[in-house]
């Protein structure tokens, strides 16, 4: 009789352990579902905001032809400015023509007035040649007006309607550029 009772007790204990395990699994599963749900919601929100914002340029960016421009509201040195642009999927501004220069300077006049803005132009320390960040040469009319007397690396910036040069370690605003999204319609 005693043996029978102890066998039943052991079976009950085993059942209890199994139920606890099942409960634990269920709790884990529930937590996993909640995480999955969060994941899906975040993904949907990101996707929807991307889909909803199917304009050629992101919010707070200015469009001109095939390009989108972002005028920073913070100062940074040239290299940090480049990093900030890359994080936005863009690079520092690369001015290809006088028309683009006119658009930029006109826009800056409307937005902020006469400040200094880094662009993606730097001077090779060895050859002294000015090059855009993609390795191309600026057109003759788009070379910085003054040669900086700095012994350090020299970078280009826009002020009013001029391209100028300065020590890359000075702090300025900056302008990022990315390609505008083409409409699929």
């Amino acid at each position: 009789k005693l043996l029978q009772v102890s066998t039943i007790a052991m079976q009950q204990q085993e059942k209890l352990i199994q139920q606890e395990r099942a409960l634990l699994n269920f709790t884990e599963w529930k937590r996993s579902c909640a995480l999955q749900m969060k994941y899906c919601q975040a993904f949907m929100q990101n996707s929807l905001s991307s889909a909803h914002n199917s304009s050629p340029c992101p919010n707070n960016w200015i469009q001109n032809r095939e390009s989108c421009y972002y005028v920073s509201e913070i100062w940074s040195i040239w290299h940090t400015s480049q990093e900030n642009c890359l994080k936005e999927g863009s690079t520092l501004l690369q001015i290809e023509s006088k028309e683009e220069m006119d658009f930029i300077t006109g826009s800056l006049r409307k937005i902020k007035g006469s400040y200094d803005y880094w662009v993606g132009l730097s001077q090779d320390g060895h050859s002294g040649r000015w090059l855009w960040q993609d390795g191309s040469s600026p057109s003759p009319g788009l070379l910085p007006a003054e040669r900086s007397q700095s012994a350090n690396q020299v970078c280009g910036y826009v002020k009013s309607n001029s391209l100028l040069s300065s020590n890359c370690s000075t702090w300025k605003y900056f302008i990022c550029e990315k390609y505008a999204l083409r409409s699929s319609v």
Epitope: Y39, L86, K87, G89, S90, T91, D134, E177, K178
Partner: nanobody, 121 residues
Framework: QVQLQESGGGLVQPGGSLRLSCTAS????????MGWYRQAPGNQRELVAA???????AYTDSVKGRFTISNDNAKNTVYLQMNSLKPEDTDVYYC???????????????WGQGTQVTVSS
Amino acid sequence: QVQLQESGGGLVQPGGSLRLSCTASGSFFSINAMGWYRQAPGNQRELVAAITNGGRIAYTDSVKGRFTISNDNAKNTVYLQMNSLKPEDTDVYYCNAKAIPIYGSTAEDYWGQGTQVTVSS
């Protein structure tokens, strides 16, 4: 979390070529830019070359005309073709991805382990 798998480093003679490649995997919403940085002992990491998801490119002055960066957006892979290598290109080269995490709205930096490039005769 983004994992970056680099390959292609090694020892090469001056004037020689190497091709680095780096693939991003893991969970992320999107990658805004990928690129290569290098770091010599005791120095800060500096950008060598980067390419955005839209195809815009940036190089550091010392590699312009010698290195070419390219990407395959579908494979989340970036390549760095290094030609006319010089002894001063010797460094550890780190792959970088500027990716927006699943739960985030701004891009964060993710780094590979680094691959050694040695240019020596």
